[in-house]
């Protein structure tokens, strides 16, 4: 017997789509051979209409695909716009249609349903509004109104003009009666359940000449959108529920193999802790709709998503929702990166950031993720030029080493950086990715000095202490400015004698500025390099005076032991108006990092995700 | 959480056919898989067959020792899934299970299924 397994029935209605999944046992040879989807020929013969090496019959163009799951051992094959010229035998299997490597599956699509005899037929999705409309005569005007809902042989009153409300439709149910001039009654029901469901009877009058209309109520529930993502990649739920629940709470949940479905983030502020730092919930337009960005996707994301209004927050019988399948696809384009750089304080990071190489010219963003209220991502640098003003002269985002990588440098750290950020383009959304930075025990390990004046006109010699576990490394001074750091002339000037325990390796490195002028005012980066990947770097900031007596400086490294000058570190903290600033720019098609440029210094907690994947902050 | 209570089981000779219900009550609005397993004295518990549901498209599985004797069916209205059982063998006896399930990533696997029946028992005799 084949070990292919899947559906052998499938049955469906014209216009729907099916979703097919065939099983096979994950082997090495079974996980990369081709797959297929053909359908059988009364002669015996299998025509294949889709396969996963890219084929797509004329058929099914624009509306199949077929998805392998190779980690799971599985494969999709998703067809939408059925006709019944779809019913038929077919076959999913791998390797060549004829070789037996595969399962039988009836597909049967049968005609919609029809209206039935002077019955009104109502679709409506669950949790949303219906309206029944129930026509009559002028006689039966001033006559009592009522709603009946026919259960097995017996119809069961469930509201009426007197003031009676069946006890299931309680706080969900009303009977409107139209104006004088509309011999017209309408009953609203909320909150639709599946159990609402059913053949309805309006009624107005009792006696032999009421007028009756019949009314056929279908509740949908929402059929789950598949939605297919890459491991380490976002996903966007975009969750439009209509204006009626503009005002209630919303929610994400996820639903867990029972009946429950955890929440995974809601209006309400509570937010699921596996999603701590890689989760943002858009604020809602005025029509109710909202969007939840989930980015760092992990292979124990994938399963079912609901989204919903509640007052709750939570999922409850009667929330309109809707529903998402999200596969993660373990074979993924976007490449391992460090999910958790450490640093010391006083010392820096280097972080990696990947992005869709197809889109080298995109802008490249960093953002601070805070987790406050729905979540939110200002801002603090892009490729652009453009550096958030507490980040200056500690903060630079280069295009190094390009070619789908570029890398986010922040120095001068203290304890308050700890936290989530985001790396992301205005290019492919799929491409956001999270690190976590924390702040370890430990002493930088590239020593310079505090802070330094400069004279105008003289010399200033900056040094930098390099210790011998750098020796393989490219040493450099750079002048920091908005688009970078531009790399200056510096002269090795042999062995260190900073460090203990530290031989011939290690390096006093120096920064010469001749003939100091006020544009030479600013922040100054020494660092360790390999190639375009970069490591530690430490700042210091020299500020230029008027010649009070004549020579040139030379900066000992007493001040570089001592803890750098407060004043300057804490005029990158200092705090500015709160203003956000809608970069136009980023993201036109959703807010997901919405409050782009916010210029307020939001806390900072660390939160330990558990992540597996690590990296020290000299680390490539 | 969902209830779910089987009926239908019984003694029957070889040859004959039964038919199993499986009702289920409570949360059941967010259920859209629903199955049934089988456990023969002194044996593992088995997949037997798996109809899930996603609007009006409905997905059914079989286990090969079933295929073509076994039909599994549902009926929306009444939150109830029912087994028909032709052509029964000796071999068909056992307690059947009824499970059901939010998600469906294996309908074989028996953890996939987070609600179970109490079970029915099918005595078949030759």
């Known amino acids: 017997k084949s070990p292919i397994f899947g559906p052998e029935e499938v049955n469906s209605v014209e216009g729907n789509s099916v979703s097919i999944t065939c099983y096979y046992p994950p082997t090495s040879v079974n996980r990369h051979t081709r797959k297929y989807w053909c359908r059988q020929g009364a002669r015996g013969g299998c025509i294949t209409l889709i396969s996963s090496e890219g084929y797509v019959s004329s058929k099914y163009a624009g509306r199949a695909n077929l998805t392998n799951f190779p980690e799971n051992g599985t494969f999709v094959v998703n067809i939408a716009q059925l006709s019944q010229d779809d019913s038929g035998r077919y076959k999913c299997g791998l390797g060549i249609n004829s070789r037996g490597l595969s399962f039988d599956v009836s597909l049967e699509v049968s005609q919609g349903p029809g209206l039935l005899n002077d019955t009104k037929v109502y679709t409506v999705d669950l949790g949303r509004t219906v309206t029944i409309n129930c026509p009559f005569k002028t006689e039966n005007a001033q006559k009592r109104k009522s709603l009946y809902k026919q259960i097995g042989l017996y119809p069961v009153l469930v509201i009426d003009s007197s003031g009676y409300v069946n006890p299931n439709y309680t706080g969900r149910i009303r009977l409107d009666i139209q104006g004088t001039g509309q011999l017209l009654f309408s009953v609203v029901i909320n909150q639709l359940r599946l159990s609402d469901a059913g053949q309805y009877l309006c009624q107005a009058g009792d006696d032999s000449n009421s007028n009756k209309k019949n009314a056929d109520l279908q509740v949908l529930k929402p059929e789950p959108e598949l939605v297919y993502e890459d491991l380490r990649g976002s996903v966007t739920f975009h969750c439009a529920l209509g204006p009626e629940v503009a005002n209630v709470a919303k929610f994400l949940c996820r639903q867990s193999s029972g009946e429950n479905c955890d929440v995974v983030v809601n209006t309400l502020g509570k937010r699921a802790p596996a999603f701590e730092g890689r989760i943002l919930l858009n604020p809602q337009d005025k029509d109710g709709s909202f969007s939840v960005v989930i980015t760092g996707l992990r292979k124990e994301d994938a399963g079912r998503y609901l989204c919903g209004a509640h007052s709750d927050g939570q999922l409850q019988e009667g929330s309109p929702i809707q529903a998402w399948q999200l596969f993660v696809n373990e074979e993924s384009t976007i490449p391992r990166s460090p999910t958790v750089v450490k640093g010391v304080a006083g010392g820096s990071v280097a972080v990696l950031c990947p992005y869709n190489r197809k889109e080298s010219k995109s802008i490249k963003y960093w953002c601070l993720w805070e987790g406050a209220q729905n979540g939110r991502c200002p801002l603090l640098v892009d490729s652009e030029g453009w550096v958030k003003a507490q980040y200056e002269g500690r903060l630079s985002l280069l295009e190094e080493p390009g070619n789908g990588t570029f890398t986010v440098i922040l120095n001068q750290l203290t304890s308050r950086d700890a936290g989530f950020y985001w790396c992301l383009t205005n290019g492919d959304t799929l491409w956001r990715t999270t690190v976590e930075i924390k702040i370890i025990e430990g002493e930088p390990n590239l020593k310079v000095p505090g802070n330094v004046t400069a004279v105008l006109g003289e010399t200033l010699k900056v040094p930098c202490h390099f210790p011998c576990k750098f020796s393989s490394y490219e040493k450099y001074w750079c002048k920091w400015n908005n688009t970078g750091c531009q790399a200056l002339p510096s002269q090795d000037e042999g062995p260190s004698k900073a460090f203990v325990n530290c031989d011939e390796n290690s390096r006093l490195v120096s920064l010469t500025l001749n003939l100091v002028t006020r544009a030479d005012e600013g922040w100054y980066w020494c660092g360790v390099k390999q190639g375009h990947f970069y490591g530690e770097t430490a700042a210091v900031y020299v500020a230029v005076e008027e010649r009070k007596a004549a020579g040139s400086r030379d900066v000992s490294l007493a001040k570089a032991d001592a803890a750098p000058d407060e004043k300057v570190l804490d005029s990158g903290f200092r705090e500015i108006e709160n203003k956000a600033i809608q970069d136009p720019r980023l993201f036109a098609e959703e807010k997901a990092v919405a409050d782009t440029r916010d210029q307020a210094d939001g806390s900072r907690a660390s939160v330990d995700s558990g992540s597996s994947e690590e990296q020290g902050g000299s680390s490539r | 959480e969902v209830q779910l209570v089987e009926s239908g089981g019984g003694l029957v000779q070889a040859g004959d056919s039964l038919r199993l219900s499986c009702a289920a009550s409570g949360r059941t609005f967010t259920t859209y898989v629903m199955g049934w397993f089988r456990q023969a004295p002194g044996k593992e518990r088995e997949f037997v067959a798996t109809i899930a549901w996603s609007g009006s498209t409905n997905y059914k599985y079989y286990a090969d020792s079933v295929k073509g004797r076994f039909t599994i069916s549902r009926d929306n209205a009444k939150n109830t899934v029912y087994l028909r059982m032709n052509s029964l063998k000796p071999e068909d006896t056992a307690v059947y299970y009824c499970?059901?399930?939010?998600?469906?990533?294996?309908?074989?696997?028996?953890?996939?299924?987070?609600?179970w029946g109490q079970g029915t028992l099918v005595t078949v005799s030759s």
């Open positions: 499970a059901a399930s939010t998600v469906l990533t294996d309908p074989r696997r028996l953890n996939e299924y987070a609600n």
